[in-house]
């Protein structure tokens, strides 16, 4: 038995309730099938309305052996062929195509803008706390603590460039050594991969789409975690990154250059600056130990200021702190000196929404977080819808072949490296690995890009973001040039080392296998995706940080037994899979452990019970929202469930034994409507959701 056994159906015989479900279910999503419903023998099946409580059961069925859920779906064209259209139809089709393309660009623009606002929101909510993490210099000398600080700060501010610039400032002002900064940079690398994982969560509507999207996003996470797992101990033992970057800096003479062109920011800034503008220096000041910065707001109020340099008498501890002996005196009580003080004169206020609101940072952060996540979710659904309707037939075939086909033999191995370069180039253009990987996530979900191709593109994105950092470092002022360049190079060589570890030999492409495994689990237990996100990006780093505060002995005392236990489980798992004969009978599977220790099923039941309580309270809201959405998208045939009735009454009416009433079983989300009778489109892109998920 595997550690995470497949989920059985909620009822032993689902066919009792679902007509036409006698044969094995096809793994091709409904939207990719024809419009006529047939059973496996080919005979038409009467179209039935599924009971709300069981509308998701078909999706829970295990995919049959012959059908690999990781195979990219066929994006069939169910529309009228071009040749069959009349001239009016052709013109209409062209305009429709142009309209869809404009809409796609519009939603993509909104998507990128909402990512930017999301980052600002995170900074407002957790930016000051993130700065405080950095201000604790004593623990940062501990590489493990440094690593988790890097993760936490980047997760909190949703921007590796912000955390990197804080590190650069700290190194430049000798608050932090390059040696201590390297683990933090590694942590920042991990933290930045959370964004596309959050984006993947938005595709939880369709199991197979979610499976692919989540795996495609977490391949980035696994690459970063595995790289750190190997390279952090290596760096702690040998300091190879520090030495290598020192060598590079000494070998080549670097002059101040120009910063990387900020193509994307030029387009998105006019819009995002109308929503919110932040003073990112505040987080930096907190990190540098400026106590006054704690009381400053991150929200930028004045956008145009004039700096006046005035001479001011300031008190100093002793004449040694004076600007020069000529400008040092005492009034008999304190020692004074003359200093040039820059006074800021406010000229013009910023033009964003929150400029005149006297709301605290946290409140603005929560508002923006909610709004940006909703916009992000909406945009993603619309992008997936539009792509789904555009990428059909010949277009889909061409795009999929272009993206996923390897070069002819013997150059097939070069394809991946070209993908790495493409990923690096694209990231360099958009100036953000988060934007690139987040934009790629829905494409992986709908099956345009395979996980195998997404992996090198993601690795390239990791390289692209470091080349951007190198250029940014070259554009930095003289006093921070060396430190910022060394940190950018450390980041670069860390990613190069990671690629060398986990890419060249196909056998070592462990992140793909792990991501697929996580994708399978998350597709079945969708709440596990949220758990993964919270556990790996928040709870684990916070726990390690807490233990680090307690000191090395505590960290080692708690950490070593946990690591040994994980290694033991991994070894046992390997032996169970490879050579179970050498193991005693009891250890050949996990049945010797209680079910909750080796299966997600009991946990799933608990979460299902919890969400059923939640469902009772908010199902009516869902129904109202569903109707509003139906009106907005103009789909006349969508059905919103009558879930406002007490669920217990419904159960009595149906006289069906229910194991655990699950998440949002809203049939509105499963009923499909005809798009001019040609292709099927789901309402808001959401299919029937699992009976046992949190979503």
């Amino acid at each position: 038995m595997a550690p995470w056994p497949e989920l059985e159906n909620a009822h032993p015989n689902p066919n009792k309730f679902i007509e036409g479900a006698s044969g094995p279910q096809s793994s091709i999503p409904d939207k990719d099938k024809g419009t006529s419903k047939t059973n496996d023998s080919g005979t038409p099946v009467a179209k039935i309305e599924l009971l709300p409580s069981y509308s998701a059961l078909v999706l829970i069925e295990e995919p049959p052996e012959g059908n690999d859920p990781w195979d990219l779906p066929e994006l069939q064209d169910n529309g009228i062929k071009w040749s069959e259209r009349d001239s009016k139809g052709k013109i209409l089709c062209i305009f429709q195509g142009i309209g869809k393309f404009i809409l796609l660009l519009g939603f993509l623009y909104l998507f990128v803008c909402s990512l930017d606002v999301l980052s600002s929101a995170f900074q407002l909510v957790g930016g000051k706390m993130a700065g405080q993490f950095f201000s604790n210099n004593s623990i940062m000398s501990n590489p493990v603590a440094g690593l988790v600080i890097g993760v936490l700060v980047t997760v909190m501010v949703q921007s590796s460039s912000t955390s990197s610039s804080i590190i650069v400032s700290m190194v430049a002002s000798s608050l932090l050594s390059v040696r201590a900064a390297i683990p933090i940079i590694m942590g920042a690398n991990i933290g930045t991969s959370i964004t596309n994982t959050i984006v993947a969560l938005m595709q939880a509507g369709d199991r197979n789409e979610f499976r692919r999207a989540f795996a495609g996003a977490t391949v980035h996470d696994f690459f970063n975690w595995l790289s750190v797992l190997v390279l952090l101990p290596l760096e702690a033992a040998t300091h190879y990154l520090e030495k290598l970057t020192n060598l590079v800096l000494e070998t080549f003479s670097f002059q101040n250059g120009e910063d990387a062109p900020d193509i994307l920011k030029v387009i998105t800034d006019p819009f995002t600056k109308l929503i919110i503008q932040l003073d990112k220096k505040v987080i930096q000041q907190i990190a540098m130990g400026d106590s006054e910065a704690q009381n400053k707001s991150l929200i930028k109020i004045w956008c145009k200021t004039i700096s006046n340099v005035i001479e001011e008498n300031v008190t100093v501890p002793s004449p040694d702190n004076c600007t020069s002996p000529s400008y040092c005196w005492t009034d008999g009580i304190q020692t004074w000196t003359i200093q040039n003080v820059t006074e800021k004169e406010n000229i013009a206020k910023c033009q964003h929404i929150f400029v005149n609101f006297s709301l605290p940072d946290l409140a603005v952060g929560i508002i923006l977080l909610t709004v940006s996540l909703l916009i992000l979710c909406g945009c993603l659904i619309m992008i997936v819808k539009l792509l789904g309707s555009v990428l059909r037939g010949q277009v889909a075939t061409v795009i999929k072949k272009t993206l996923n086909t390897d070069f002819p033999f013997p150059f097939a191995w070069l394809t991946g490296y070209l993908a790495i370069l493409v990923g690096a180039g694209m990231t360099f253009i958009v100036q953000s690995s988060s934007v690139f990987t987040s934009a790629m996530t829905p494409l992986i979900g709908i099956g345009v890009i395979s996980i195998e191709r997404a992996y090198p593109l993601t690795l390239g994105s990791n390289i692209g973001t470091t080349t951007t950092a190198i250029l940014a470092a070259l554009a930095s002022p003289g006093n921070t040039l060396r430190s910022s360049l060394q940190i950018a190079l450390c980041h670069f060589f860390f990613n190069i080392s990671g690629i060398l570890l986990w890419y060249p030999i196909p056998f070592t492409r462990l992140p793909i296998r792990l991501a697929k495994g996580l994708g399978n689990i998350s597709a079945k237990y969708r709440w596990f995706a949220v758990f993964y996100l919270i556990f790996f990006f928040l709870l684990t780093p916070l726990t390690v940080f807490g233990l680090s505060l307690a000191g090395w002995p505590v960290l080692v005392g708690v950490g070593v037994p946990i690591i040994l236990l994980i290694l033991l489980v991994l070894c046992l798992r390997m032996l169970q899979a490879r050579c179970p004969r050498i193991l005693p009978l009891k250890l050949r599977d996990w049945n010797f452990l209680p079910l909750w220790m080796h299966s997600l099923k009991p946990w799933d039941n608990i979460i299902s019970l919890a969400t059923s309580c939640f469902q009772r309270r908010c199902c009516c809201c869902c129904r109202v929202c569903c109707r509003v959405c139906c009106m907005v998208c103009g789909c006349k045939c969508c059905r919103c469930s009558k879930c406002c009735k007490n669920l217990e009454e419904e159960e009595k009416e149906q006289d069906v034994p229910v194991k655990a009433s699950g998440g949002f079983d809203n049939t509105a989300m499963s009923k499909e409507c005809q798009d001019e009778g040609k292709g099927q489109v789901e309402v808001l892109g959401m299919k029937a959701l699992s009976n046992t998920t949190v979503f």
Partner: antibody
Amino acid sequence: EVQLVESGGGWVQPGGSLRLSCAASGFTFSSHIMYWVRQAPGKGLEYVSGISSNGLSSYYVDSVKGRFTISRDNSKNLLYVHMGSLKPEDMAMYYCARGGRDRVPAVFDYWGQGTLVTVSS
Amino acid sequence: DIQMTQSPSSLSASIGDRVTITCRASQSIGTFLNWYQQKPGKAPKVLIYVASSLQSGVPSRFIGSGSGTDFTLTISSLQPEDFATYYCQQSYSVPITFGQGTRLEIK
């Protein structure tokens, strides 16, 4: 006309305490730093203590730190020094002096006539 | 603490003479040095502040100069009322310190 008049001097046994006062007139008392400077018989001048115009900051020379307390009452134009745990070496003529405004190099531009403190058993 | 050393400790001069008193600081004090005159039984009176500025009401025969560690007070033409003890004082750093004084007597 600027005037500074000290009072409160006298004879005291070692270990005893005394409070000297300085009454100021003829200028805006609350705008100036005020000082106490002493001169032992037949010796040179020695700076003792100073207080800022608002009375929030003060300074004491090491030899009197912890024993003397300087204070001022701007509403009454009075400067005080409370001298505790007096030692024979504290015996001197105590002068009250006016300084410039805050943050200005210390110049004792006006002095009182002084009050004598005698410490002996 | 900054030590201030005056020389000579005492000097005799006649009316009309040009007299120079020097003051040396143990470390550079810029120009933050003041000169005082004290007559027996009286309170001191400021003559020169910040090394060379003449206090209002003080005759112009008193000239201050110097910077860093070496300073001089020059009385260009000695008058009967000038016979007194002269002190230098630094206002560079706390504690404020005075020189030991120079006694100027009639020859």
